[in-house]
């Protein structure tokens, strides 16, 4: 069964910077990745970035840079301009659309007591969508 993993990492050098790492474990080719925060895509979450293997990437503030790490994983850098970080309590979700599996989504967040540089363990909560 395909699975999506999500890791949220606070940058050790800059406490207002975070990186979300997401990956797809399974066969098939990725056709689109959508990253959202505050909840799943299409279910109350706010779209932060979309990545397409051919059409490129788009991101919306507070996202700063979305990029492919491998053919099946991505990273998204976020910059919190506020004095206190809302990211610490926020859920980030990654949805991978792949052929022929369909869409799989998983969410993760920064552990409440994490030290800078530590990341949340993978928290796959797959949501199968019949697209």
């Amino acid at each position: 069964t395909p699975e999506v993993w999500v890791q949220v990492q606070m940058e050790a050098t800059e406490l207002s910077s975070f990186t979300v790492h997401c990956g797809f474990l399974g066969p098939g080719s990725i056709s689109l990745v959508t990253v959202s925060w505050g909840g799943p895509d299409g279910a109350g979450g706010t779209k932060l970035a979309v990545l397409h293997p051919e059409l490129g990437t788009r991101q919306w503030a507070p996202a700063r840079q979305a990029r492919w790490e491998t053919q099946s994983s991505i990273s998204l850098a976020l910059e919190d301009s506020g004095a206190s970080s809302p990211f610490a309590n926020t859920t980030f979700c990654c949805k991978f659309a792949s052929f022929p599996e369909g869409s799989w989504e998983s969410c993760g967040s920064l552990p409440p007591s994490s030290d800078p540089g530590l990341s949340a363990p993978p928290t796959p909560v797959p949501i199968l969508r019949a697209d």
Epitope: G45, K47, A61
Partner: antibody
Framework: QVQLQQSGPELMKPGASLKISCKAS????????INWVKQRPGQGLEWIGW????????YYNEKFKGTATLTVDKSSSTAYMLLSSLTSEDSAAYFC????????????WGQGTTLTVSS | DIQMTQSPSSLSASLGGKVTITCKAS??????IAWYQHKPGKGPRLLIH???TLQSGIPSRFSGSGSGRDYFFSISNLESEDIATYYC????????FGGGTKLEIK
């Protein structure tokens, strides 16, 4: 086809408030950011802010924080911009525009709403 | 905030000719620039995004290029319907328009 239909022209008095509407059709309203843009007479375009209809999350140009408030009504696929404490500086054309994501920013625009603030 | 300096602010060209508009960003915008045509009484029209990607239905007379901080927009084989004001927009971080270029035909 994608369409954004804005409310009609308005003549308002200084100090008043105005809510401009932008009704979307032809696509899934909750999937795309809606932006608002200002154009003063004879001037260029200025980005006011955006709202993501799926969550109601907003992001404003610092210049317009406190004067513009963006909201949506998902049930009617309508975006709104409330302009408060109007002054003559608010006299302008206001446009809503959809963000097309990978198809480019502001790929569809409303026809504009002209606001005149005068005593 | 990223600033966009667009030049020239106005230009006049002959039918069938070619014009080029420049936008310079205050920092690298990673090719995240779009170009719009705006005619009075209408909403602007997206012509090009991501520096050089032509929007569906836009004639190939319109083109874009550039990288880093410097970007260019050209119209070749000018037609009378091209009379309009043209704007660049950076969308690498938030959104900033250039000041606009008013195109007139000689």
């Amino acid at each position: 086809q994608v369409q954004l239909q804005q409310s009609g022209p308005e003549l308002m008095k200084p100090g008043a408030s105005l809510k401009i509407s932008c009704k979307a059709s032809g696509y899934t309203f909750t999937d795309s950011y809606i932006n608002w843009v200002k154009q003063r007479p004879g001037q260029g375009l200025e980005w006011i802010g955006w709202i993501f209809p799926g969550s109601g999350s907003t992001y404003y140009n610092e210049k317009f924080k406190g004067t513009a408030t963006l909201t949506v009504d998902k049930s009617s696929s309508t975006a709104y911009m409330l302009l408060s404490s109007l002054t003559s500086e608010d006299s302008a054309a206001y446009f809503c525009a959809r963000d097309g994501g990978l198809r480019g920013p502001f790929d569809y625009w409303g026809q504009g709403t002209t606001l005149t603030v005068s005593s | 905030d990223i600033q966009m300096t667009q030049s020239p602010s106005s230009l006049s060209a002959s039918l069938g000719g070619k014009v080029t508009i420049t936008c310079k960003a205050s920092q690298d915008i990673n090719k995240y620039i779009a170009w719009y045509q705006h005619k009075p009484g209408k909403g602007p029209r997206l012509l090009i995004h991501y520096t050089s990607t032509l929007q569906s239905g836009i004639p190939s007379r319109f083109s874009g290029s550039g990288s880093g901080r410097d970007y260019f927009f050209s119209i070749s084989n000018l037609e009378s319907e091209d009379i309009a004001t043209y704007y660049c927009l950076q969308y690498d971080h938030l959104l900033t328009f250039g000041g606009g270029t008013k195109l007139e035909i000689k």
